[in-house]
Interface confidence: low
């Protein structure tokens, strides 16, 4: 007899129990499933998703969830009109509570929230809310994705039809239709105050099976501002028993959440069962790998005007502001080259896609630091001229940031190009992602016995005879005792760190979306004649989780569009909705060879010595290579390795100067995990330690890119 209610798995004596509300009182019973117990399951390991089917046959069905939604294949369904929400604008009562179930954090809704429309067969009542998240710093945690792009958090609201059933549990146990909404949370520079009661609640349910009443919140405020654009498909529960009874409504637009607020999710603990031994671990990566669509059709809503803006507007500007009305994709092929000791030349190519032609001109914006002040200049260049600009009177000890924006009619703008960094008189280059917080041992659990939290440390790693001094800075682990290169997280040259004012101690993390209010000067950096060029880009890849059992496309950036409400997207990458086929067309068009083609997953990665990587002239790269074109994220799912929508295949040499530390403490770090140098072939089975944030750069391979974006001051409107 099935007593299992998938929604509230709670680990009790080795079994997953079901929360059943006692309708005659406020008590909640946890039914312990023993002799007739529902099967234990987990998100990884021996009881992980690939094994769910052995105890829950439906998990092997053909209509499973979650899925990747490819926008271009979604059909507009005329029956999918406006959602009618009832009660969503009311403040929740003080009886609404949150529980750490061990598999998720669930909110038990005690008030009447109803939804109808959207093709739902009747008026459905909201029962509960559940969350799915990644492991740190905005890494991919959503279950669903759009065009391969996953998000840091997915909130799911579950509904049942009270006209048909007296409770949600009955609907589940009867294998009847239920409804579910999926809402993505995207990283934003600022806290989302609507989430405060939820975040506060999370702090009260840190440990498994903890419960807490929630401060009043407005459920509507947890939904996207615009509800008109959504996808619809039929699928399943995303946890055992995976019943294929769910009518999914997946909102296209995300809800903002700050890094600080994300930390509350990453701080939740669970209890895991390993060979009859229970261990307390962080609850992270609590998402099911994506499932095949099979014969299903994904529909999209037919709400008038809801899909007017190109998908880029939400991928890059989740808050859906005026800045989202872009007229083209970004200018590409950004380059900065020194002409002489005091002049630089910036060049670019026209955008690949122009939504609202023609391009009238280009705005070149550059900023630098001088005497502790940040300065910025902007000038225009007609589109019919050479796509180059010369910057004269370059100061030798300033860090310059360049970006270009196309301007169309009616002062419509493109997205910003990659931001290029140029620093004269420096030979050492910081390569890798943003600096992340150190000295927080509790921020990540050890994921295996040979891992332990670190605060900071330094070491030296050598590949092909080239020494790299690095500083360990991570919310995660130090190198594993196995010595695997795959667990090294940020390769940073200590000289440049010192020059930027960083010592060996804890370093503030810096969110990807805020330009430093004061750009770092390089006064104390080593003074040598080489002039490296550093490119950053806003489009970052979210790592897929370790242990994803199906090759889903989650290499797409969870961080695109983490913009301040009024800021333009500065993503230099192509994040429009190209699926694999479109990507490959673009590859052929631009003549770019992707890493996936260049280096088969099972072939060794050559690592030739490259002594003159940053030779005189600054923009020269490895001999025999015209340019380092591609930054490719490690495909954590073992799936595709091409540069997907979140990565620009036309990226130039892409190393990055770390943002300066500021008074503000941010909890973010870049989720991107680029290719690791390795003496052995990178096999499909190789994965990186889940919480590792160390990045090493193989000079012979692709560089990594990070992200810098602009705060309100000096914004180019």
């Amino acid at each position: 007899v099935l007593h299992y209610v998938v929604c509230f798995p709670a680990l009790t004596e080795g079994y997953v129990g079901a929360l059943h509300e006692n309708r005659h009182g406020s008590a909640v019973q946890i039914r312990r499933r023993k002799a007739s117990g529902d099967p234990y399951w987990a998100y990884s390991g021996a009881y992980g998703p690939e094994h769910w089917v052995t105890s829950s046959v439906s998990c092997g069905g053909r209509h499973q969830s979650p899925i990747d939604i490819l926008d271009q294949y979604a059909r507009v369904g005329e029956e999918y009109q406006e959602l009618q929400l009832d009660g969503f604008d009311n403040e929740s009562s003080n009886k609404t509570w949150m529980k750490n179930t061990g598999k998720t954090v669930a909110i038990l809704l005690k008030d009447d929230y109803f939804v109808s429309g959207a093709g739902l067969p009747g008026r459905f009542k909201a029962e509960k809310v559940e969350f799915h998240w990644g492991h740190s710093n905005g890494s991919a945690g959503s279950e669903h994705s759009i065009n391969g792009r996953r998000f840091p958090v997915e909130m799911q609201i579950f509904f049942y039809n009270p006209d048909d059933f007296d409770s949600f549990q009955t609907a589940i146990s009867e294998n009847r239709i239920i409804g579910a909404m999926a809402i993505f949370f995207q990283v934003s520079p600022r806290d989302n105050s609507a989430l405060d009661p939820i975040i506060h609640g999370l702090k009260g349910v840190v440990h498994h099976e903890k419960e807490t009443f929630l401060d009043p919140f407005v459920l509507r405020d947890l939904l996207p501002a615009s509800l008109g654009s959504y996808y619809r498909y039929t699928g399943s529960l995303t946890t055992p028993p995976c019943s294929e009874i769910v009518e999914w409504i997946v909102f296209r637009r995300p809800v903002p959440i700050s890094y600080h607020q994300l930390e509350a999710f990453y701080s939740i603990f669970t209890t895991e069962q390993q060979d009859h031994v229970k261990s307390v671990e962080y609850l992270r990566n609590n998402f099911r790998p994506q499932q095949r669509l099979h014969d299903r059709v994904v529909s999209k809503s037919a709400v008038r005007d809801s899909w007017n803006h190109d998908m880029t507007d939400f991928l890059e500007n989740p808050l859906g502001t005026e800045a989202s009305k872009v007229c083209s994709s970004p200018p590409i092929h950004m380059k900065v080259q020194p002409l002489n000791q005091t002049a630089l030349q910036v060049s670019w190519s026209q955008p690949e896609t122009i939504y609202h032609p023609p391009i009238m001109n280009y705005m070149i914006s550059y900023s630098w630091t001088k005497n502790e002040d940040e300065k910025e200049k902007t000038f225009t260049k007609d589109s019919d001229k050479d796509l180059k600009a010369t910057i004269s009177h370059v100061s030798p000890d300033s860090l310059y940031l360049f970006r270009v924006q196309a301007v169309c009619r009616n002062d419509m703008r493109s997205d910003f190009s990659q931001t290029m960094l140029f620093q004269a008189n420096t030979t050492r280059i910081f390569q890798g992602t943003r600096i992340v917080k150190t000295g927080v041992p509790t921020a990540s659990p050890a994921s295996s016995a040979d891992m332990a939290p670190i605060s900071s440390g330094s070491s030296t790693w050598t590949s092909s005879g080239i020494p790299f001094s690095f500083v360990s800075m991570a919310t995660g682990m130090g190198p594993s005792s196995s010595g695997s290169q795959a667990t090294v997280a940020s390769v940073v040259t200590s000289t440049l760190l010192a020059g930027l004012g960083f010592g060996g101690g804890g370093i503030s993390s810096f969110p990807s979306t805020v330009w430093p209010t004061r750009l770092p000067t390089a006064a104390s950096a080593s003074k040598q004649a080489a002039r490296p060029v550093l490119a950053t880009t806003e489009a970052l890849a979210s790592p897929g989780p370790d242990g994803d059992s199906s090759p889903t496309k989650d290499g797409e950036g969870t961080e695109e569009g983490e913009k301040d409400e009024k800021s333009e997207s500065e993503d230099g990458e192509r994040e429009h909705e190209e699926d694999g086929e479109k990507d490959s067309e673009k590859k052929e068009k631009s003549g770019v060879t992707h890493a996936a083609e260049e280096r088969n997953q099972t072939e060794p990665s050559p690592t030739p010595s490259s002594p003159n990587r940053t030779a005189e002239g600054g923009h020269q790269t490895i001999p025999g290579h015209e340019q380092d074109h591609t930054a490719v994220p490690t495909d954590q799912t073992g799936g595709r390795r091409d540069a997907g929508p979140g990565l620009d295949p036309d990226m130039v040499t892409s190393t990055q100067v770390p943002p300066t530390a500021t008074e503000e403490q941010y909890a973010g770090s870049d989720p991107k995990r680029p290719e690791m140098p390795s003496k052995k072939p990178m096999s499909r089975g190789d994965r990186f330690s889940e919480d590792s944030r160390f990045i090493t750069v193989n000079p012979a391979e692709k560089n990594t890119s990070g992200m810098i974006s602009r705060p309100a001051p000096g914004r180019m409107e």
């Epitope: 439906s58 006209d163 294998n175 009847r176 239709i177 239920i178 294929e244």
Partner: antibody
Framework: AQSLEEFGGRLATPGTPLTLTCTAS????????MSWVRQAPGKGLEWIGT?????DAYYASWAKGRFTISRTSTTVDLKMTSLATEDTATYFC???????????WGPGTLVTISS | SFVLTQPASVQVNLGQTVSLTCTAD??????ASWYQQKPGQAPVLLIY???SRPSGVPDRFSGSSSGNTATLTISGAQAGDEADYYC?????????????FGGGTQLTVTG
């Protein structure tokens, strides 16, 4: 392969109680709602009732009181009382899946009520 | 009570496309499923939730729903498609949950 089979169909006189039993192979009965559907000779399909995973049963209005569905972990039973000639039909045991759909049907067992 | 109405019989030429309908007052709020039954056999599920097809069902069979009418479409009708076709849906609330079958449509394939 997943399948169902019904047992207990036979010739009976009006008023005689009769119990039909359904067993499954290839899947666990306990995970699904199970239903009984009947079809009189030359007529259409007629839903009798459904029993959920937790044992709660739902019946067609005409079947209430005369038909009772029960289940164990391995069987689903249909207990019929006060049978009349118009209850002559092939009785199908059916698995309900996908929400509101009958995806696996047994071959049926014939119940004939005749005096 | 809730009644599903189907045409008693429909004819189609071999290789042609035929649509079988199922109507009810509030069908727009319900999911329809479709079943094929050949003489002497148990019914087989063809379509569930209006449009979804179980694995093993040929893609010649498709379902749709508009307003209070659910439709089963058979494209390229074959002799083996000659059978009775039933639609079904659910109705009711709470403990009065009901499942209802239509009267069935006998499909004849000619030629």
């Amino acid at each position: 392969a997943q399948s169902l089979e019904e047992f207990g169909g036979r010739l009976a006189t009006p008023g005689t109680p009769l119990t039909l039993t359904c067993t499954a192979s290839g899947f666990s009965l306990g995970t699904y709602s199970m239903s009984w559907v009947r079809q009189a000779p030359g007529k259409g399909l007629e839903w009798i009732g459904t029993i959920g995973g937790r044992g709660d049963a739902y019946y067609a209005s005409w079947a209430k009181g005369r038909f009772t569905i029960s289940r164990t972990s391995t069987t689903v039973d249909l207990k019929m009382t006060s049978l009349a000639t118009e209850d002559t039909a092939t009785y199908f045991c059916v698995r309900e899946n996908y929400g509101y759909a009958f995806d696996i049907w047994g071959p049926g067992t014939l119940v004939t009520i005749s005096s | 009570s809730f009644v599903l109405t189907q045409p008693a019989s429909v004819q189609v030429n071999l290789g042609q496309t035929v649509s079988l309908t199922c109507t009810a007052d509030t069908l727009s709020r319900r999911y329809a499923s479709w079943y094929q039954q050949k003489p002497g056999q148990a019914p087989v599920l063809l379509i569930y939730r209006d449009t979804s097809r179980p694995s093993g069902v040929p893609d010649r069979f498709s379902g749709s729903s508009s307003g209070n009418t659910a439709t089963l479409t058979i494209s390229g009708a074959q002799a083996g498609d000659e059978a009775d076709y039933y639609c079904a849906t659910s109705d009711g609330s709470g403990s009065s949950y009901q499942c209802v079958f239509g009267g069935g449509t006998q499909l004849t394939v000619t030629g």
